[in-house]
């Protein structure tokens, strides 16, 4: 009798490797025998499609090699011309090991912008991508960020994130790797510390120093009153990435003089430009208006009580500021031979960093004044007896020299850290030191006080002391 | 105990004048920075001025040209001399005492411009 | 201008929590081995108030629950409050004296849950 077709077993969704064999069954049950068709997503899939075999008599369909493109919904459609045609349908996923089908490249890029390192992949299920940086796994923050398509997005690059890079991509069959690629990162000329301008006496010599940085290192040329230089020496030297030159000049004239840090980009150059005048007057005293430029401290004699690589102040207002200002100190620093020992390294702290103050940056950098509670402390504990002495000889006008008024500051006329903590420096020898304390009669005072706080010395002097005093 | 008291705020229109003045006491007002910072309504600190001990003064960009700030040390007084205002610039005016870190804020005086 | 990000922007915090506020600098703030990061509490209807300087310094008077952290040459200076307390409810601000302007970051309200 005839028999409308009934499929007994549906079709069921089929995992497939790449490459591999897929077979989808399509049983029939009917009489007389069924006209079996197939449809991929609908598109009847061809009998002499060569992609495909399709075998007794219909029920059995075989992709012989799948490819990713290969994915879908596959139906069986049975019909003998008795009752209706029947369907059973069934998906085919298609399953493939992690493939970089764009790998990053290398790539060269300005400090500041955005770099984006490439890495499509393909599988399913869909990979995973991750970056390493050199052999660490590389961790996102806020300025990066591994996109939905698995490209490395760095906002704002800084020098730190040049480096070898490479992306991985992993899912449950497999994982793929890139070949390693070079973020460089290229860094605009950039001057670290200008030409300063000098106000000298006829015939002095004058160092102009100035110090650029940038990747690939800048070259630097200086400029007089805009034609190159034609007298005078320069000196260079490249280190970490700056380079440093010194312009010495013998001054018969004044003159405009520009420092010009130049470096290559591709095609294109990046400068920076500093320029200094060098005028010719006479002399002139230390200003009140702190004239002058923040600098490293490369003398000798404060070096074991300035901090290690400390900005000082250099006051613009001596022809050679940094010359100058170390002869100061030596003077006096030879004078303090004859102290005390309790007085002496509490004296030389506050000589030092009363001569070289501590630079301070905010609207611009300038000097700051050593903080009341350690002049007092130097004063009137330390150094009482010959801190008397001295105001003894100052007013009776035995010093012939202004110095030794530069050595010794008017504690009353200091700022307190009690009312701006960042108003003035510390000296950290005189800081109180939990491990070794030392005992100092404490000093009286009825008006409010407070402590010197701890902080961590700046040299390997163990002087210690926890010394209260007045904050008006 | 330092104690910095701000006075002058006020209704304003656009394109109007104030002056505002800040007295100090309880420490050597003349040894220290000063600094004017404001707060618009509802928004964050936003900082206009300081001048160092020296007198000499410096501006955020939004008020360069416009306000000015200055002091006298005998009276213990910081001043800043609003010109040319704007409703934008309507805010509480803070005198703020610090160098780097704006350690001492007195209360506030509003300034309010508008038409 | 130094541009400064706060995160989060608000933040909820039973008594006793630990709350962190991060501050990133869009460059480096250290200067003469100090990196010059300032933290302040404004509580609400109040004038602010400086809770660290120098970006680890507690002021003279702030309750050691409140610290700050940041070293080197990095741009990212966290406040941490270890045990939040009732009247620690206030907006916080970040703010750098590196160069001029000096500039705040937007805040990050902190509110009892």
């Known amino acids: 009798l005839p028999k409308a077709p009934v499929i007994t077993t549906p079709l069921e969704t089929v995992d497939a490797l790449v490459e591999e064999v897929a077979t989808f069954m399509c049983a029939v049950e009917s009489y007389p025998q069924p006209e079996i068709s197939w449809t991929r997503n609908k598109i009847l899939i061809k009998l002499f499609d060569t992609r495909y075999s399709i075998r007794e008599n219909g029920q059995l369909l075989t992709i012989l090699s799948v490819e990713d493109s290969d994915d879908g919904i596959y139906c069986c459609t049975a019909n003998n011309g008795v009752g209706g045609a029947v369907e059973s349908c069934g998906a085919l996923q298609v399953k493939m090991k992690p493939k970089i089908t764009r790998p990053p490249i290398n790539v060269k890029i300005i400090e500041g912008l955005k770099a984006v390192l490439p890495c499509t992949t393909m599988g399913n299920p869909k990979p995973s991508v991750s970056w390493i940086k050199g052999d660490s796994p590389l961790r996102e923050n806020s300025r990066t960020a591994v996109l939905e398509s698995g490209s490395l997005r760095i906002h704002n690059v800084q020098k730190e994130d040049a480096g070898q890079y490479r992306c991985v991509a992993k899912n449950s069959l497999g994982t793929a790797y890139s070949k390693v690629v070079k973020l460089e990162v290229e860094v605009f000329a950039r001057i670290l510390r200008a030409p300063e301008s000098h106000n000298v006496t006829f015939g002095s010599f004058v160092t102009l120093h100035c110090t650029a940085t940038g990747i690939p290192v800048p070259t630097i040329t200086w400029i007089e009153n805009g034609n190159a230089v034609s007298s005078g020496s320069i000196q260079e030297s490249v280190k970490d990435r700056v380079i440093d030159s010194r312009l010495q000049l013998f001054i018969t004239k004044p003159g405009l003089y520009t420092c010009i840090a130049t470096n290559k980009h591709g095609e294109k150059f990046s400068t920076a430009k500093a320029a200094a005048t060098v005028s010719i007057a006479e002399w002139s005293k230390p200003q009140k208006d702190n004239k002058g430029y923040c600098a490293q401290y490369r003398g000798e004699v404060c070096n074991a009580v300035l901090a290690k690589d400390a900005l000082v102040f250099l006051n613009t207002s001596y022809a050679d500021p940094e010359e100058a200002q170390e002869l100061l100190v030596h003077t006096a620093w030879n004078e303090l031979k004859v102290v005390s020992p309790l007085c002496r390294p509490a004296a030389e702290a506050l000589l030092c960093n009363h001569v070289f103050q501590e630079c301070s940056p905010g609207v611009v950098p300038t000097p700051i004044p050593i903080c009341r509670e350690y002049c007092l402390a130097v004063k009137e504990l330390f150094c009482a007896k010959e801190w008397l002495a001295m105001e003894e000889k100052t007013h009776r006008g035995l010093y012939r020299s202004e110095m030794h008024l530069l050595s010794v500051p008017e504690c009353s006329k200091l700022p307190s850290m009690h009312w701006d903590p960042t108003a003035c420096a510390r000296l950290p020898h005189l800081d109180y030191n939990k491990e070794n304390p030392k005992t100092f009669p404490p000093m009286t005072s009825s008006k409010p006080s407070v402590d010197i706080p701890n902080l961590p010395s700046s040299s390997s002097s163990s002087f210690s002391v926890s010394p209260t005093y007045s904050m008006t | 105990e330092v104690q910095l008291v701000e006075s002058g705020g006020g209704l304003v229109q656009p394109g109007g004048s104030l002056s505002l003045s800040c007295v100090a006491s309880g420490f050597t007002f003349s040894l220290y920075y000063m600094n004017w910072v404001r707060q618009a309504p509802g928004k964050g600190l936003e900082w206009l001025s300081v001048i160092d001990t020296h007198s000499i003064a410096y501006y955020a960009d939004s008020v360069k040209g416009r306000f000015t700030i200055s002091r006298d040390n005998v009276k213990n007084t910081l001043y800043l001399q609003l010109n040319n205002l704007k409703p934008e610039d309507t805010a509480l005016y803070y005198c703020v005492l610090g160098r780097t870190a704006l350690v001492r804020w007195g209360q506030g005086t509003q300034v309010t411009v508008s038409s | 201008e130094i541009v400064l990000t706060q995160s989060p922007s608000s933040v909820t915090a039973s008594i006793g929590e630990k709350v962190t506020i991060n501050c990133e600098s869009s460059?480096?703030?250290?200067?003469?081995?100090?990196?010059?990061l300032n933290w302040y509490q404004q509580r609400p209807g109040q004038s602010p108030r400086l809770l660290i300087y120098w970006a680890s310094t507690r002021q003279s008077g702030v309750p050691d629950r409140f610290s700050g952290s940041g070293s080197g040459s990095t741009t990212d200076f966290t406040l941490t409050i270890s045990s939040f307390q009732p009247e620690d409810v206030a907006v916080y601000y970040c703010?750098?004296?590196?160069?001029?302007?000096?500039?705040f970051g937007p805040g990050t309200k902190v509110e009892l849950k």
């Open positions: 460059q480096s703030v250290l200067y003469n081995q100090k990196n010059y």
């Open positions: 703010q750098q004296a590196y160069n001029a302007p000096l500039t």
